[in-house]
Every structure is written in structure tokens, then in C-alpha cells.
């Protein structure tokens, strides 16, 4: 279930969830469709200061790079 993740524990969780894709500490630019730009929060704010789940962690994974055809 949802839990609080801080420090190295948060990095470990992101590495596990995102794998070789890597991850961002801030949501990628252009993330979401909100017109009114609120101050940007990052994964630290979202998961260390309140409980977060797998879905929220996945939001900070880098996009998959398309594999080149041989």
C-alpha cells in the first residue's frame, strides 16, 4: 500500500519501478495540462512528505527510448 519514502529509500524505489529508463526528481516539462502554473513539486515533496503509491512513482520515470531497428 501507499507509504512514505525518503532519502536513499526513495531512490531505491524509483530505480526499481523505472528500471533502465531512469527517472526525474521533477516531473518532465510540459507534464499535465494545467493552464495555471502552480509552483512545481517534485517526487521528494510528493513521496517523502506524504504517502505515495506505485502509480505516483511511475509518473517520475523517464520515457522509454525507442529501440533502433537492426
Amino acid at each position: 500500500g501507499p507509504e512514505t519514502l525518503c532519502g536513499a529509500e526513495l531512490v531505491d524505489a524509483l530505480q526499481f519501478v523505472c528500471g533502465p529508463r531512469g527517472f526525474y526528481f521533477n516531473k518532465p516539462t510540459g507534464y499535465g495540462s494545467s493552464i495555471r502554473r502552480a509552483p512545481q513539486t517534485g517526487i521528494v515533496d510528493e513521496c517523502c512528505f506524504r504517502s505515495c503509491d506505485l502509480r505516483r512513482l511511475e509518473m517520475y520515470c523517464a520515457p522509454l527510448k525507442p529501440t533502433k531497428a537492426a
Epitope: 512514505t4 525518503c6 502552480a38 509552483p39 513539486t41 517534485g42 521528494v44 512528505f49 506524504r50 504517502s51
Partner: antibody
């Protein structure tokens, strides 16, 4: 057990830059979140900003244009720079640590260092 | 004006129970962000007293307890002692400010 010690000049002139250092002992700077907090004389606590060793930083919006928090992993230190100071920046400045075992609570604090802004 | 509102002062006699409230909004406490409480004895640095709404760090007596409901939180101190006289601060995260926020602080006076 992590311990923190603030250091820096106790007197800064108006319009100059306040520079403080927090030395970390008993733990690696690469493992935790590090914060600066201040307390003007006779007033409450004000969060200045924090950073994670990865480079993720977050600053108080009211101070953001004047604040920089940086880290020197080789010395196990992190620092605060506050530019264009005025008398309103006179305060006790604390560094603090979120070790991650306390759900984001700042569980280790330095003893604080008093900074006076005056000409 | 603090984002989190605390009463400026509370008082109680030794042995009594006192509570300190911390009122926030839907962008901080009400958004699910944890509330932490700090005790600041005169002339010293703050000390974490309650973390994650209702958890005590090791060494903190069970006379201190925290709770959270909706957009508010509270700290309760039972069996009040003279050395509980201090300033108490609540802290949380605010998504609209994208930063940590403290309450204005509450001065606890132990009477007698």
C-alpha cells in the same frame, strides 16, 4: 548518529551576501535531505529551503530569488547563501536533516548560529 | 500570517492535560501531507517531538501524542510538567507554495 554544526560570520552588512556552512558528522551527505531554517528574534520558525544530494532543491517562494543552497560532498558540508540582505534577515539560522526515518520530519538540528545584519 | 494557524499561547497546571491545535487547509494538511511537531525549549534549537502525525521519536515520553483530522492537527500533552514549558511548532508541506510551512508557534506556560 548524525550531528550538525553551523558556522559563518555573525555580522553581515546590508546589501551583502550572507554565507553559512553546515558541517555534517556521523553520516553521509549523500543519504539524506538537508534543510535551512531561520528564526528572527522573538519570532517563529521560517523554512528557507532544502536539497537532496541528487541536486533536487526546493526554496521558500518568498526567498527564492535570493537563496542558493549547495553541497560539498568531499567535505561533507552544505551551505546557504542569501544575497542582498536587510535587517529583516537578522535571525538565528539552523541547519537540519531529514534522515528519512521520520516521514519527512526534521529529526536532527544544529545548535543554530546568530546572524545580525547591520552596518 | 502563517499558513498553519496555532494559538499564540496555552497554559495548564502541573498534572493537567493541554492540547495545541494546528489548522491548515486543503493544500497542506487536508491534502494528506504529514504533520510534524517540534518542541523548542528556551535558548535551544527545536527538537522533533511528533512525526508523521502521531509517531514519537525514541526518547520522547508517551505523555506527548499527535492526531490529525481533515485540515487540522493537534498535539496533546498529558501529566503536564514544569519542564514542558516551551514553544511548540507544527510543520507540514504545502502544495500551493511548493514548500514546507511552519505554524506560528504556541507558547506553553505551566502554571504554579
Amino acid at each position: 548518529q548524525v550531528q550538525l554544526q553551523e558556522s559563518g560570520p555573525g555580522l553581515v552588512k546590508p546589501s551583502e551576501t550572507l554565507s553559512l556552512t553546515c558541517t555534517v558528522s556521523g553520516g553521509s551527505i549523500s543519504s539524506y535531505y538537508w534543510s535551512w531554517i531561520r528564526q528572527p528574534p522573538g519570532k517563529g520558525l521560517e523554512w528557507i529551503g532544502y536539497f537532496f544530494y541528487s541536486g533536487y532543491t526546493n526554496y521558500n517562494p518568498s526567498l527564492k530569488s535570493r537563496v542558493t543552497i549547495s553541497v560539498d560532498t568531499s567535505k561533507n558540508q552544505f551551505s546557504l547563501k542569501l544575497s542582498s540582505v536587510t535587517a529583516a534577515d537578522t535571525a538565528v539560522y539552523y541547519c537540519a536533516c531529514i534522515t528519512g526515518t521520520t516521514k519527512g520530519g526534521m529529526d536532527v538540528w544544529g545548535q543554530g548560529t546568530t546572524v545580525t545584519v547591520s552596518s | 500570517q502563517s499558513v498553519l494557524t496555532q494559538p499564540p499561547s496555552v497554559s495548564g497546571a502541573p498534572g493537567q492535560r493541554v492540547t495545541i491545535s494546528c489548522t491548515g487547509s486543503s493544500s497542506n494538511i487536508g491534502a494528506g501531507y504529514d504533520v510534524h511537531w517540534y518542541q523548542q525549549l528556551p535558548g535551544t534549537a527545536p527538537k522533533l517531538l511528533i512525526y508523521g502525525n502521531n509517531n514519537r521519536p525514541s526518547g520522547v515520553p508517551d505523555r506527548f501524542s499527535g492526531s490529525k483530522s481533515g485540515t487540522s492537527a493537534s498535539l496533546a500533552i498529558t501529566g503536564l510538567q514544569a519542564d514542558d514549558e516551551a514553544d511548540y511548532y507544527c510543520q507540514s508541506f504545502d502544495s500551493s507554495l511548493s514548500g514546507s510551512v511552519f505554524g506560528g508557534g504556541t507558547k506553553l506556560t505551566v502554571l504554579g
